[in-house]
């Protein structure tokens, strides 16, 4: 299976955690506008997570447009120097457990759980379906396993998972065995498949973060979320590389596709951005 055709590379300290935008306009597509001037401007690319150059026509467009690279960075990037990955033997909570619950900028609201550092408990909130931060768990149990203290005042196994043969799902284990995987890819890879609002039946793929594989689904042709790819390969490139595999001595290796990188093709227009 080509899905298993992977190489291993050491993870670096500059690897970014899932994207958290400072301003909603940073998620807008670069818009050159209807005019015909040729003006060098910069925009924030949510896929590469970098400020990039584009040619602006001189009128209209949107707020994701900056005169200089520095201005773009100032408005749309934040210091990602602090790594949020902890070694397998550390007892303290991952840093993201202390982040405020973040619904993100989209509006496909679904139930998620976050660790409330004030109450020291995992609680429910409504997640918009894209972006946000890593204090965001699909189940209460997963949140508790990663962020809540164990009965003796220390962490239960933060990332321990076991494949459940009955329903092919991942179930958290409250043991001290080092885990195999963590997810640090784009946050939309963690969102459920969303058919959207129209009536078409297009063959698409979404990343199932529970089983760690790309699976087919029927897309209606509009709406939905970013976890939506035209091919299995594209889905794997975007999401499979986000799994970080642990090795026994607490080191980290990242599973990475051998194939050439390809930019994820997603219609930004389908992101419902809310006022912030």
């Amino acid at each position: 299976d080509s899905e298993e055709d992977e190489e291993h590379t050491i993870i670096t300290d500059t690897e970014l955690p899932p994207l958290k935008l400072m301003h909603s306009f940073c998620a807008f597509k670069a818009d050159d506008g209807p005019c015909k001037a040729i003006m060098k401007r910069f925009f924030f690319n949510i896929f590469t997570r970098q400020c990039e150059e584009f040619i602006y026509g001189g009128c209209e467009g949107n707020q994701n447009r900056f005169e200089s690279l520095e201005e773009c960075k100032k408005m749309c990037t934040r210091d990602n120097a602090n790594r949020i990955i902890k070694t397998t033997l550390q007892q303290e909570k991952p840093d993201f457990c202390f982040l405020e619950e973040d619904p993100g900028i989209c509006r496909g609201y679904i139930t998620r759980y976050f660790y409330n550092n004030q109450t020291k408990q995992c609680e429910r909130f409504k997640y918009g379906g894209c972006l946000g931060n890593m204090n965001n768990f699909e189940t209460l149990e997963e949140c508790k396993n990663i962020c809540e203290d164990g009965p003796n005042g220390f962490q239960v196994d933060n990332y321990g998972t076991q494949l459940n043969a009955v329903n092919n799902s991942l179930t958290p284990q409250s043991t001290k065995v080092p885990s195999l995987f963590e997810f640090h890819g784009p946050s939309w890879c963690l969102t459920p498949a969303d058919r959207g609002l129209c009536r078409a039946n297009e063959n698409r793929f979404y990343y199932n973060s529970v089983i760690g594989k790309c699976r087919p689904f029927k897309y209606s042709g509009c709406g939905g979320n970013e976890n939506n790819f035209t091919s299995k390969q594209e889905c794997l490139r975007a999401c499979k590389k986000g799994f970080i595999q642990r090795i026994s001595k607490g080191g980290l290796i990242k599973t990475k596709r051998k194939r050439k990188k390809q930019r994820v093709k997603i219609a930004y227009e389908e992101i419902f951005v809310k006022n912030m």
Epitope: E100, E101, D102, P103, Y109, I110, T111, Y113, N116, Q118, T119, Q121, E123, R124, F125, K126, E138, T139, L140, P192, M276
Partner: antibody
Framework: EVQLVESGGGLVKPGGSLRLSCAAS????????MSWVRQAPGKGLEWVST????????YYADSVDGRFTISRDNAKNSLYLQMNSLRAEDTAVYYC???????????WGQGTLVTVSS | DVVMTQTPLSLPVTLGQPASISCKSS???????????LNWLQQRPGQSPKRLIY???KLDSGVPDRFTGSGSGTDFTLKISRVEAEDVGVYYC?????????FGQGTKVEIK
Amino acid sequence: EVQLVESGGGLVKPGGSLRLSCAASGFTFSSYAMSWVRQAPGKGLEWVSTITTGGSYTYYADSVDGRFTISRDNAKNSLYLQMNSLRAEDTAVYYCARQDGNFLMDYWGQGTLVTVSS
Amino acid sequence: DVVMTQTPLSLPVTLGQPASISCKSSQSLLDLDGKTYLNWLQQRPGQSPKRLIYLVSKLDSGVPDRFTGSGSGTDFTLKISRVEAEDVGVYYCWQGTHFPFTFGQGTKVEIK
């Protein structure tokens, strides 16, 4: 004892603005998401807006999005609702409510009446 | 948005007799996490709403056990086993499963 006390309501002309406040006591305010819900005279309840524990993120009903702004000051144990471009249909009693760990409203204030009329 | 429909809208009852209010939602209130976020509020005349029941059947602290909530999916019921004078008021069901939160129109309970 959990207490939520709203204030700031009154009579305002269409297009005008008003700022509601909700003073919270009897619980650790910063631990809870908070909401505003309104009730038009003789009518049912309508959810208006919710703000996360730290105040960085917000949710709005479509009917008020772009006109109303929810905010909070955890140091002052206070929740606010800035209402701009008010319309006659915004006339209602506005309640602040606390969200529990299930993201459900558990405690409600006594409400403050906002009347939008020329 | 999810539409919540309550019946009846008015419920005259005799003191000491049972009362039942129905609440139906336009779509299932069973969330992805396996919980059903259906709740009941009581609003006594001239007062603010007070939560009675959450997650279909859990009673809030201080709520008399003559109140019971039941149901699943789209059909829910609030029952008062023996109505007392202090139970007069408007009862609302509301859902916290889907965003935005939505409320029923309310059922006015009054003494015959």
